[in-house]
Amino acid sequence: GPGPCDGNPCANGGSCSETPRSFECTCPRGFYGLRCEVSGVTCADGPCFNGGLCVGGADPDSAYICHCPPGFQGSNCEKRVDRCSLQPCRNGGLCLDLGHALRCRCRAGFAGPRCEHDLDDCAGRACANGGTCVEGGGAHRCSCALGFGGRDCRERADPCAARPCAHGGRCYAHFSGLVCACAPGYMGARCEFPVHPDGASALPAAPPGLRPGDPQR
């Protein structure tokens, strides 16, 4: 059958040991009684842990009460409250108890303080500037048209920012892709090849379809 120490009858952190007849509690400092239920501790002893506020207990005969801060419980605020046991995060979100606050780390495709918003729905999602919404892997994303970027394709991206056209060539941000207009004397998709005075180019081997001054296709 169940032993007398099952369920730990000793309060206030006392340790239970079985005796031939029953059990015996070995009480921590400041506690006494059969089950260590009587406190000899006062607020002067600072019995409240984890920032708990002690009230009462000015003399050995009067009890004290610990008012615990959020996230802690127990007569001495010694126990951390497991707020994640209530499973507050929805849609498979990971619960993180930071003590001062609760955080939900949401799975891809979900958002909100409790992961309550389902983002994996292209029907209700607008991608700006000609972008298209793509679903997959439990998430969604906007596939942006050329020249745009960001979460909703609202940010302008300049394909010419990296200065891809060599030898002073001009880069234009055309909707079909970047375009190089080469300075006189150069040719190639990126204006990388000089054109010799006789009209021949310095191409190691002329790529098919590449003419002097050809733009990027």
């Epitope: 020249g147 300049d158 880069c171 941000a173 055309h174 909707f175 003419r211 001054g213 733009p215």
Partner: antibody
Framework: QEQLVESGGGLVQPEGSLTLTCTAS?????????MCWVRQAPGKGPEWIAC???????TDYASWAKGRFTVSKASSTTVTLQMTSLAVADTATYFC???????????WGPGTLVTVSS | QVLTQTPSPVSAAVGGTVTISCQST????????LSWYQQKPGQPPKVLIY???NLEIGVPSRFKGSGSGTQFTLTISGAQCDDAATYYC??????????FGGGTEVVVK
């Protein structure tokens, strides 16, 4: 919506000066374009005047426009055209236009009329 | 750089075909950086074709561009009343130079 709007046109006397402004909305000159000025005299075809390349600020002019016309970038959304020693023959609608690649003007403003007359 | 357009004016019946040619005194950049515009009174030019043969977004497929180097053609197949306008070719040349043709007036009857 990307738009261009010209302003600053009006009546000016021969040998006078005028500055036209092109204001962009829906985009800025942080991307690389040729922002250009094109004019069209009454009953005539369009005539290219000048461009400023927003990538590095370099400018290009029609041979006839060098010296009297100056194109510059005033801000990330405005380009200006300064015109001096204006003649009656400069009477035209002045358009601001953007080359977005392949050397064509895909975006135009509605134009501003400049009349040179005494 | 001079662009010469022929003929002007040109007349066509509704449903007919209109052909406009544009000749350049020198080759355009990349041999195909030539565009075509349509202009109606009181409006700026509107691009129809870029890079000699590419149809601009939103332009009806009855407009077709062809050619390379110095010789280019705009063809309107199945002309509509709304196509009555003046058409211009425009080239881009090495050295970052632009030029427009003189224009071709199209009358649709």
């Amino acid at each position: 919506q990307e738009q261009l709007v010209e302003s600053g046109g009006g009546l000016v006397q021969p040998e006078g000066s005028l500055t036209l402004t092109c204001t962009a909305s829906g985009f800025s000159f942080s991307s690389s374009y040729d922002m250009c000025w094109v004019r069209q005299a009454p009953g005539k075809g369009p005539e290219w005047i000048a461009c400023i390349y927003t990538g590095d600020g370099s400018t290009d002019y029609a041979s006839w426009a060098k010296g009297r016309f100056t194109v510059s970038k005033a801000s990330s959304t405005t380009v200006t055209l300064q015109m001096t020693s204006l003649a009656v023959a400069d009477t035209a609608t002045y358009f601001c236009a953007r080359n977005s690649g392949y050397g064509y003007f895909g975006l135009w403003g509605p134009g501003t009329l400049v009349t040179v007359s005494s | 750089q001079v662009l010469t357009q022929t003929p002007s004016p040109v007349s066509a019946a509704v449903g007919g075909t209109v052909t406009i040619s544009c000749q350049s005194t020198e080759s355009v950049y990349g041999s195909d950086w030539l565009s075509w515009y349509q202009q109606k009174p009181g409006q700026p030019p509107k691009v129809l074709i870029y890079q000699a043969s590419n149809l601009e977004i939103g332009v009806p497929s009855r407009f077709k561009g062809s050619g390379s180097g110095t010789q280019f053609t705009l063809t309107i197949s199945g002309a509509q009343c709304d196509d009555a306008a003046t058409y211009y070719c425009q080239g881009y040349y090495s050295g970052y130079i632009y030029a427009f043709g003189g224009g071709t007036e199209v009358v649709v009857k």
